[in-house]
Interface confidence: low
Amino acid sequence: MMTGTIETTGNISAEKGGSIILQCHLSSTTAQVTQVNWEQQDQLLAICNADLGWHISPSFKDRVAPGPGLGLTLQSLTVNDTGEYFCIYHTYPDGTYTGRIFLEVLESSVAEHGARFQIP
């Protein structure tokens, strides 16, 4: 029975050219986390495997940094980075938990005047 819940940073916005931390947290379960996948819609960004460590997808290696913790740091943001991001927790014995984050990357002036810039 899956008793856990995923807490995420929810809907966040960041400034073009800046950085953002994507963070998920699995709570309310004693299941062992064997792996966390970070995906952007249908693209794999990164894998954090309990035994193998981090693997960053080559197409993102210049702009994605592992951590902090099981989170993911996106750097040099562009407007094209706007969209849904998923943290997929593979656990034993529970199975798979998925969290969703929506990131909106704003032009600098919009971010400054809109006061929507958030760091999780």
């Epitope: 064997t34 792996q35 995906e39 249908d42 894998i47 309990a50 193998l52 997929i88």
Partner: nanobody, 115 residues
């Protein structure tokens, strides 16, 4: 019990192609991650390619990007690794792994690329 059976390895000349298959039983590809690893003599086992839970998400090591293609057939519970433009440095034993955990491995299939 999870069982993974690789096939498709062999001896091929540089520039040639091979298609590896990994048939999984006791395990469903859906909502899981499958990976291909390789281990050359005297080297550590390295992740070559992986396919994500959605089937559309893929990972490739820099050394094989643009040459290797991973795919999955959920109906057959099989993962494939199409290897094109093979190089001598691709010579290794190739293993598939369930969910990249490192606790379920196949027996491996030898790939030898001659120059």
């Amino acid at each position: 019990e999870v069982q993974l059976v690789e096939s498709g390895g062999g001896l091929v000349q540089a520039g040639g192609s091979l298609r590896l298959s990994c048939a999984a039983s006791g395990f469903t590809l859906e909502n899981n991650m499958m990976g291909w690893f390789r281990q050359a003599p005297g080297k550590e086992r390295e992740l070559v390619s992986a396919i994500g839970w959605s089937g559309a998400s893929t990972y490739y090591a820099d050394s094989v990007k643009g040459r290797f293609t991973i795919s999955a057939d959920n109906a057959k519970n099989t993962v494939y690794l199409q290897m094109n433009s093979l190089k001598p440095e691709d010579t290794a034993v190739y293993y598939c792994a369930a969910n990249l955990r490192g606790d379920n491995w196949g027996q491996g299939t030898q790939v030898t690329v001659s120059s």
